[in-house]
Interface confidence: medium
């Protein structure tokens, strides 16, 4: 009897949908795996007789529930199927947006770039999929614990009247208000303000 794959899960970030599993202990030799998806009531092969422990399902429709399954195989034997259900639009993790930060005197000018979606048009981003897409921005004075959160209305924001010659850190994440779903924070970007332009030099 061939044991089934273990720890079967979907690792999905920005609709890059990778079905992952672990190979069970099997004394007779190396196992191969076949992964399938349900399409119009028929299971279709996606990865056949692979020695890998993952299979890319990024081409699935983003909407609706998908049934995926994987089994282990050895020679003419095979394990039972292990099934999981996956809804990309609900289950994918929203990766961190990009952010460009520019210092102008005592202001930080920020531009946000929604995460790109692989296997789509070059310009296709998470914003194209989620109508309610918005950004959460948080910023703080470097070295302090107090954080300030804002929700920009657009793909850019300006933090004005900051303390001069002070380093501020900023990070951004995607947020879907209608789903109350937040994405991953970007890495903090820290920049030092310069002089206050209203002060004569």
């Amino acid at each position: 009897m061939v044991p089934p794959p273990e720890n079967v899960r979907m690792n999905s970030v920005n609709f890059k949908n990778i079905l992952q599993w672990e190979s069970p202990a099997f004394a007779k030799g190396n196992l191969t795996f076949t992964a399938q998806y349900l399409s119009y009531r028929i299971f279709q092969d996606k990865c056949m007789n692979t020695t890998l422990t993952e299979c890319d399902f990024s081409s699935l429709s983003k909407y609706g529930d998908h049934t995926l399954r994987v089994r282990a195989e050895f020679a003419d034997e095979h394990s039972d199927w292990v099934n999981i259900t996956f809804c990309p639009v609900d289950d994918t993790i929203i990766g961190p947006p990009g952010m460009q930060v520019e210092v102008l005197a005592d202001s930080l000018h920020m531009r946000f770039l929604a995460p790109k979606i692989e296997n789509e048009y070059e310009t296709w981003t998470m914003k194209n999929v989620y109508n309610s897409w918005t950004y959460n921005v948080q910023y703080w004075k470097n070295g302090t614990d107090e954080k300030f959160q804002i929700t920009p209305q657009y793909d850019f924001e300006v933090l004005r009247n900051l303390e001069p010659w002070t380093t501020y850190c900023v990070q951004v994440r995607g947020f879907l208000p209608d789903r109350n779903k937040a994405g991953e924070w970007s890495e903090p970007v820290c920049e030092q303000t310069t002089h206050d332009e209203t002060v004569p030099s």
Partner: nanobody, 125 residues
Framework: QVQLQESGGGSVQAGGSLRLSCTVS????????MGWFRQAPGKEREGVAT????????YYANSVKGRFTISRDNAKNTAYLQMNSLKPEDTAIYYC??????????????????RGQGTQVTVSS
């Protein structure tokens, strides 16, 4: 420098429950992932559970699925591990770990960048 403070370990009879807490301090950026791993004497480290703080998505090792629950309080930068129906084989030092990088939900927590000092959990039969 990130500091992690674990608490809630102790000794319990088989079938009992414990709740571990892990608080992140001394870091100004928000945590993306928090998790727990454990190490028993003479055994390899084992990832136990992880949580993505954004959506609250969770992932568990097969050995604890259905018995352990990971949760988080983002406002307090704290993660919790509720451990029910404990077994003697759950005896180990439990470590909290956090990371600020992306795409780590299915990685064992011992691969995370920052780890705590650990708290002992002992389950007797």
């Amino acid at each position: 420098q990130v500091q992690l403070q674990e608490s809630g370990g102790g000794s319990v009879q088989a079938g009992g429950s414990l709740r571990l807490s892990c608080t992140v301090s001394r870091y100004t950026a928000s945590v993306n992932y928090m998790g727990w791993f454990r190490q028993a004497p003479g055994k390899e480290r084992e990832g136990v559970a992880t949580i993505f703080t954004g959506a609250g998505t969770t992932y568990y090792a097969n050995s604890v699925k259905g018995r352990f629950t990971i949760s988080r309080d983002n406002a307090k930068n704290t993660a919790y591990l509720q451990m029910n129906s404990l077994k003697p084989e759950d005896t180990a030092i439990y470590y909290c770990a956090v990371d600020f990088r992306g795409g780590l939900l299915y990685r064992p927590a011992y691969e995370y960048t920052y780890r705590g000092q650990g708290t002992q959990v002992t389950v007797s039969s």
